[in-house]
């Protein structure tokens, strides 16, 4: 059994989250995850879910009684979601920590917007994909 | 030229973000995007970047002078990042809007944690992948 299971059960007790009323009004994450089978779509959703848990754990970092559980779960998330890649985890954390109300951050974000947008679609990454996409479009147009 | 380019230039003027000092102290997003070539890694990072821009745009929603630009850019993000898939965009927005201090949300998140964790690594999705991973591990162990 993965180490997180026991610790997650401990958090369930603390948050009284095993209670039947918790399931009222649907799920937060599980229903959404069910909707997406494609790996890249799942990563888009899981990225938001993982950042939510990191924020939640950060919010409760002064509760000593659950710190061991939180640390174990975070470490297991690190293994599962970031493949224990510290650089990946650090870059992710950087992105989650930018303040949307900091003027310098706002200006930088707008400064980088055109380049960020240009990279958003998978096709933007490789000339090869772009070309095949153009051919596909051409074929469709000529049908 | 994509419609967002002209509108992003308009935002640059508004935020005075074309100024040379904006590039001081490195980039927010571009440096991080350069680090990741693998599509699923890029999606993890882009998910955070896109949610940052959505938050930024929301923050400026009462500035009428930039609303047209913001709407055009958001629409183009929708096309590029969500492949114009409304369901994908809606699920994403749902995830970004959960409040980390709402007790009901906290309890639900903890209630779902074990299942979320079980789905985090790509291997968790298919028995086939899991088996090949086990074989790979076995091979490594016997070397």
């Amino acid at each position: 059994q993965d180490p997180y299971v026991k610790e997650a059960e401990n958090l369930k007790k603390y948050f009284n989250a095993g209670h039947s009323d918790v399931a009222d009004n649907g799920t937060l994450f599980l229903g959404i995850l069910k909707n997406w089978k494609e790996e890249s779509d799942r990563k888009i959703m899981q990225s938001q879910i993982v950042s939510f848990y990191f924020k939640l754990f950060k919010n409760f970092k002064d509760d000593q009684s659950i710190q061991k559980s939180v640390e174990t779960i975070k470490e297991d998330m690190n293994v599962k979601f970031f493949n224990s890649n510290k650089k990946k985890r650090d870059d992710f954390e950087k992105l989650t920590n930018y303040s949307v109300t900091d003027l310098n951050v706002q200006r930088k974000a707008i400064h980088e917007l055109i380049q960020v947008m240009a990279e958003l679609s998978p096709a933007a990454k490789t000339g090869k994909r772009k070309r095949s996409q153009m051919l596909f479009r051409g074929r469709r147009a000529s049908q | 030229q994509d419609p967002y380019v002209k509108e992003a230039e308009n935002l640059k003027k508004y935020f005075n973000a074309g100024h040379s000092d904006v590039a001081d102290n490195g980039t927010l997003f571009l440096g991080i995007l350069k680090n990741w070539k693998e599509e699923s890694d890029r999606k993890i990072m882009q998910s955070q970047i896109v949610s940052f821009y959505f938050k930024l745009f929301k923050n400026f929603k009462d500035d009428q002078s930039i609303q047209k630009s913001v709407e055009t850019i958001k629409e183009d993000m929708n096309v590029k990042f969500f492949n114009s898939n409304k369901k994908k965009r809606d699920d994403f927005e749902k995830l970004t809007n959960y409040s980390v201090t709402d007790l009901n949300v906290q309890r639900k998140a903890i209630h779902e944690l074990i299942q979320v964790m079980a789905e985090l690594s790509p291997a968790a999705k298919t028995g086939k992948r899991k088996r090949s991973q086990m074989l790979f591990r076995g091979r490594r162990a016997s070397q």
């Epitope: 603390y14 948050f15 009284n16 950060k58 919010n59 409760f60 970092k61 002064d62 509760d63 009684s65 | 201090t101 007790l103």
Partner: nanobody
């Protein structure tokens, strides 16, 4: 034995704001989590908000999330509840409580309460 004294209640109009205070004595205030609860007329006492000993570990009832803000000043042994955009359904006696260590919002000591009435 911890003593808790609430203040700041009163009669206000819909949409107004109020700030409740709760002063603690007789214990090491900075070592325990604090919470606010409320009891509307004819109903049970219910959780409103909680805050950990250092000002983190915050939770709100869904009904007040985004309108109420809990904070604390350990130097003054005081916990606050800032209540904005008040509604008639916020009418209740508001109680401050210290919370049992290692629990999310299980109270061990209560104040005597302060009445908040929101008229439409």
């Amino acid at each position: 034995q911890v003593q808790l004294v609430e203040s700041g209640g009163g009669l206000v109009q819909t949409g107004d704001s109020l700030r409740l205070s709760c002063v603690a004595s007789g214990g090491t205030f900075s070592r325990y989590a604090m919470g606010w609860f409320r009891q509307p007329p004819g109903k049970e006492r219910d959780f409103v908000a909680r805050i950990g000993y250092s000002g983190q570990s915050i939770s709100y009832a869904t009904s007040v999330e985004g309108r109420f803000a809990i904070s604390r000043d350990n130097a003054k042994n005081t916990v606050y509840l800032q209540m904005n955009s008040l509604k008639p359904e916020d009418t209740a006696v508001y109680y401050c409580a210290s919370l049992v260590s290692g629990t999310l919002y299980k109270p061990n000591y209560w104040g005597q309460g302060t009445q908040v009435t929101v008229s439409s």
